[in-house]
């Protein structure tokens, strides 16, 4: 029998050390412009100089110094438009996943000092310049106020802000979360005369309340209004205000599509189409039917009119509308017509261009493979990603569509340009597509460089991170495979990483890393020096991601196969591969682990629990355990209701706790934050309970005062050190 | 032309209640906020209440919140206020008048109410 | 709540002459949101200066609005007869919306 040992053969290179991942000493850098004109765009420099640069000119020069910066111990920045004013961000206070608060100071550039005067509150929810001249709007204490200039008193727009009960222009916790995925919920016009913006109503939301105990001698507790599955939503409205008369005719309310306002619905998102031409997208709280709708301001009346003619409906017959997030319109020049993804006739995400109706939608993109995002539409370009190349779905090129021409001509713009190094990219344009920086993730490392728009041509290396690979030079990296496995006319995607000196005559133990929540991608073309990189590395792990039904960019059917029936078929899809693994000669059957966080800790508990013996150990982190313990957006887009006449039986029967009994024969490791905000410390309390009921051993390890991602330093070094010593143990690894 | 005109004043007790229209003519009505603007016998002008076009945000002044509401029904094209828990320092002609915090551009005529014993 | 105080009180001129109202308020308001208004005995108040001291529609040009800040001057360059009544300052940036106690100009 092939030996099980597996030691690491005589090299000058060292392996990976678990120090070196904690202290992050091989991480990367990328490089994104931050495009203030055609041709000139700003950036922060290693030392904190804000730099403008002129890419016809070549002309370079520092327009705020590290020591402005400094003076107020600013961490980030942003230039008023008419380029008279920077704001200055510090005091960073992180809130939720993309929320936080930070004081702001303006500094004029021209009389090179901070404005006295009227200065802003603090602590702010979200500042913004408008995209002419130098008005901002602030969000501050739930409500919204404007300022002409940087130096008049504001005007406040809203006044029914509440903490916890009404927020204006930001988002409330789910709809931040699992709808927006932004700080914000406004949007100026793009002449800097109208302001959009969301007031959420959450009186009507039940409260999660966990402790955060902090140094005090009593815990404070955290209150957060958290609709879960089936519970009341938060009531929405948009309203949209004229800022140069702000105080004549008040916020304008623009209507709800009588199709969406019959019942329950959610706003998905707002797109400026033209100074006095917005579109709003909906979503009925089931979400498969999304209506996007155009609105136009009547001069005439001063008020917004959404025609039934401009509404556009968007429905899915085999799951739910859109991907993770229902695609948003990319208008062309003519303010009427724009470009859109969304599923063709035969289930893949598709460029289509709609001019009319969805009815008589021109597709654009076609083939078994999905458009991905729509970069910019110019004149005669459009620019969007896509993993058609070579027909791997983990790939992303950028491509561009010249629309001037009939029929409208395809060129990759990525393909064929260091091939081998890159094979996910994304793209930063500057305004009408002049120029544009092209990032590089992967699979070597990654590499930004800015292009010419209209040849293509590569103008410069932005950063090709020579630090990285210098210092990875006498590191013993493992070696990654993407490849693909069939089982039963399905086809799996996975990645995986091999020990150095990899040798299949000899047999080596498994992790399956997993996370394969709907519409999600592990096995992705990207770099990485991570935890399990390490673990490839020094401790001879062999190392597996599969991206299993459910997942994204491979079509509807396999997306939508887990549609009303979370923790199925993403479970069985993971046992499949495992198996598959096995016959592959290489895997010690009996080291088998499995770990998985968020979505992949529900996956793995699972998958632990399917009683099949596949596994000797695993470790959920932050784990779902009950789709009735999630976010009613969340669970109810992929679950539906938990109410008898819809999918309640489901519900119950996917719980991790209804496994309990399963979990006697592997080693369990169960961790999770208790001040986590998303996936509450309730999942993992409810699993130990369920254990402890059933008798069952387990080990469980618990983070205070963490969130969801238990990110603080010292946790996480105590987080991978904890993982590594339970896997060590369960793999009979010496330490 | 744009035409504003109250109704509803008159006399009434200490703790009674009135209820005041303003009809509206000349402009589309459900497009713009408007608000309700007072004066004393022999005195200044005092803004009570605003309501936004479509009806969905209301604002009092603190004088009369908690006692007055302000509606509209944009389908009959007015205003409205009802006055509740009316006191001796509410007498005053009540004016409605075209927009929210300023630009009162548009006025009514005005209709007196009298608040006493 | 922001202040408005009109001063003078009464301002006695005659015909042809040039009336300068002032206006201050407690705290700043800039020009963007100060308005002044016209009555007349027994008739509702009349919108003069709008927006950033623009005059309103069917104003004449001998109103004119000035100031920024805390301190706000309407000027009319030439005294019409029919220009004799009260006028208010208001404040529209700051809820609760206010006015000044009034300016009489009266025929002296």
């Known amino acids: 029998r092939p030996s099980r040992v597996y030691k690491p053969e005589g090299n000058t290179k060292r392996a990976l050390t678990l120090k070196d991942i904690l202290n992050g000493t091989f991480s990367y850098k990328t490089y994104f412009p931050n495009w203030i004109s055609e041709q000139e765009y700003l950036h922060q420099s290693e030392d904190d100089n804000i730099v403008f640069y002129n890419i016809e000119t070549r002309e370079s020069y520092i327009i705020l110094s590290n020591s402005t910066m400094k003076s107020v111990n600013a961490t980030d920045y942003g230039l008023s438009p008419d380029r008279q004013f920077v704001y200055l961000e510090s005091d960073y206070s992180k809130l939720w996943r993309y929320s936080y608060t930070a004081t702001y100071y303006i500094y004029d550039l021209q009389n090179g000092e901070f404005v006295r005067g009227y200065e802003l509150p603090r602590p702010i929810q979200y500042l913004c310049w408008s995209p002419v001249g130098s008005k901002l709007a602030y969000v501050y204490q739930n409500n919204i106020y404007l300022k002409q200039r940087p130096g008049d008193p504001p005007f406040q727009i809203t006044y029914t802000g509440r903490e916890n009960r009404i927020f204006n222009g930001i988002p409330d916790w789910v709809y931040e979360e699992e709808m927006l995925a932004t700080k914000y919920a406004l949007w100026w016009s793009p002449d800097g005369k109208f302001l959009a913006y969301v007031e959420f109503n959450d009186s009507d939301i039940p409260i999660i309340a966990y402790s955060y105990y902090g140094d005090g001698q009593y815990p404070r507790t955290i209150n957060i209004p958290y609709p879960k599955a089936g519970a009341k939503n938060p009531v929405v409205r948009v309203f949209i205000v004229d800022t140069t008369y702000p105080h004549h005719v008040g916020p304008m309310e623009v209507p709800v599509p009588e199709m969406i306002a019959s019942s329950d619905y959610y706003f998905s998102w707002l797109t400026w189409v033209s100074s006095e031409r917005v579109c709003l997208q909906w979503l009925k709280r089931v979400q498969n039917v999304s209506v996007l709708s155009i609105c136009d301001f009547r001069e005439d009346w001063h008020a917004w009119e959404c025609p039934k003619n401009q509404e556009h409906v968007e429905e899915s017959r085999t799951g739910w509308a859109g991907g993770f997030f229902v695609s948003t319109p990319a208008f062309s020049q003519d303010a009427t017509s724009y470009y859109k993804i969304f599923s063709d006739k035969d289930g893949y995400k598709h460029i289509h261009y709609i001019k009319d109706t969805v009815e008589n939608a021109i597709q654009i993109t076609s083939g078994k493979w999905e458009a991905i995002y729509i970069f910019r539409v110019t004149q005669d370009s459009l620019f969007y990603s896509s993993n058609e190349f070579e027909g791997y779905p983990g790939r992303r090129n950028i491509y561009r569509i010249s629309i001037g021409n009939s029929p409208p001509s395809k060129k990759c713009v990525t393909c064929h340009l260091r091939k081998e190094r890159c094979q996910y990219y994304t793209a930063s344009f500057s305004y009408k597509a002049k120029y544009y920086a092209l990032v590089c993730y992967g699979p070597g490392l990654p590499i930004s460089t800015l292009h010419d728009g209209r040849t293509d041509q590569e103008i410069q290396v932005l950063e090709e991170n020579k630090e990285l690979e210098n210092s990875l030079r006498n590191i013993q990296l493992p070696k990654v495979e993407i490849k693909k496995l069939k089982d039963g006319g399905l086809t799996f995607w996975y990645k995986m990483i091999l020990p150095p000196q990899f040798d299949r005559s000899k047999k080596y133990p498994l992790l399956i890393q997993v996370y394969g929540g709907p519409c999600s991608q592990s096995v992705k073309s990207v770099f990485a020096v991570n935890w399990i990189t390490y673990l490839a590395s020094k401790e001879g792990i062999v190392i597996a991601l599969v991206d299993g039904r459910g997942t994204a960019f491979q079509g509807d059917k396999f997306l939508h196969a887990v549609y009303r029936k979370l923790g199925v078929y993403e479970v069985e899809d993971q046992l499949t591969a495992v198996r598959k693994f096995i016959e592959m000669g290489f895997i010690d059957e009996e080291r088998i682990a499995i770990w998985g966080w968020s979505y992949g800790g529900y996956v793995s508990s699972l998958a632990l629990a399917s009683g099949t013996g596949l596994f000797k150990c695993g470790i959920a982190v932050a784990p779902v355990s009950s789709w009735e313990y999630y976010a009613s957006i969340y669970s109810e887009r992929f679950m539906g209701l938990p109410t008898k006449d819809d999918n309640l039986e489901h519900y119950k029967n996917s719980t991790v706790m209804a496994r309990a009994e399963y979990f006697r024969n592997v080693d369990y490791l169960l961790i999770h934050g208790t001040a986590d905000d998303n996936v509450h410390f309730q999942n993992s309390a409810q699993i130990a309970k369920a254990l402890v009921n059933a008798q069952v051993d387990f080990q469980a390890m618990w983070y205070s005062d963490q969130n969801h991602g238990i990110s603080s330093g010292r946790s996480q070094n105590h987080l991978y050190t904890h993982m590594t010593h339970f896997l060590k143990q369960c793999f009979s690894l010496s330490d | 032309e744009v035409q504003l005109l109250e109704s509803g004043g008159g006399l009434v007790q200490p703790g009674g209640s009135l209820r005041l229209s303003c009809a509206a003519s000349g402009f589309t009505f459900s497009s713009y906020a408007m608000s309700w603007v007072r004066q004393a016998p022999g005195k200044g002008l005092e803004w009570v209440s605003a309501?936004?076009?479509?009806?969905?945000?209301?604002y009092y002044a603190d004088s009369v919140k908690g006692r007055f509401t302000i509606s509209r029904d944009n389908s009959k094209n007015t205003l409205y206020l009802q006055m509740n828990s009316l006191r001796a320092e509410d007498t005053a002609v009540y004016y409605c008048a075209k927009g929210w915090f300023g630009g009162f551009n548009y006025w009514g005529q005005g209709t007196l109410v009298t608040v006493s014993s | 709540e922001i202040v408005l105080t009109q001063s003078p009180g009464t301002l006695s001129l005659s015909p042809g002459e040039r009336a300068t109202l002032s206006c201050r308020a407690s705290?700043?308001?800039?020009?963007?949101?100060l308005a002044w208004y016209q009555q007349k005995p027994g008739q509702a108040p009349r919108l003069l200066i709008n927006v950033g001291s623009r005059r309103a529609t069917g104003i004449p040009d001998r109103f004119s609005g000035s100031g920024s800040g805390t301190d706000f001057t309407l000027t009319i360059s030439r005294l019409e007869p029919e220009d004799f009544a009260v006028y208010y300052c208001?404040?529209?940036?700051?809820?609760?919306?206010?006015f000044g106690q009034g300016t009489k100009v009266e025929i002296k």
């Open positions: 705290q700043s308001v800039t020009s963007s949101y």
């Open positions: 208001q404040q529209g940036i700051m809820l609760p919306p206010t």
């Open positions: 309501i936004i076009g479509s009806g969905g945000i209301t």
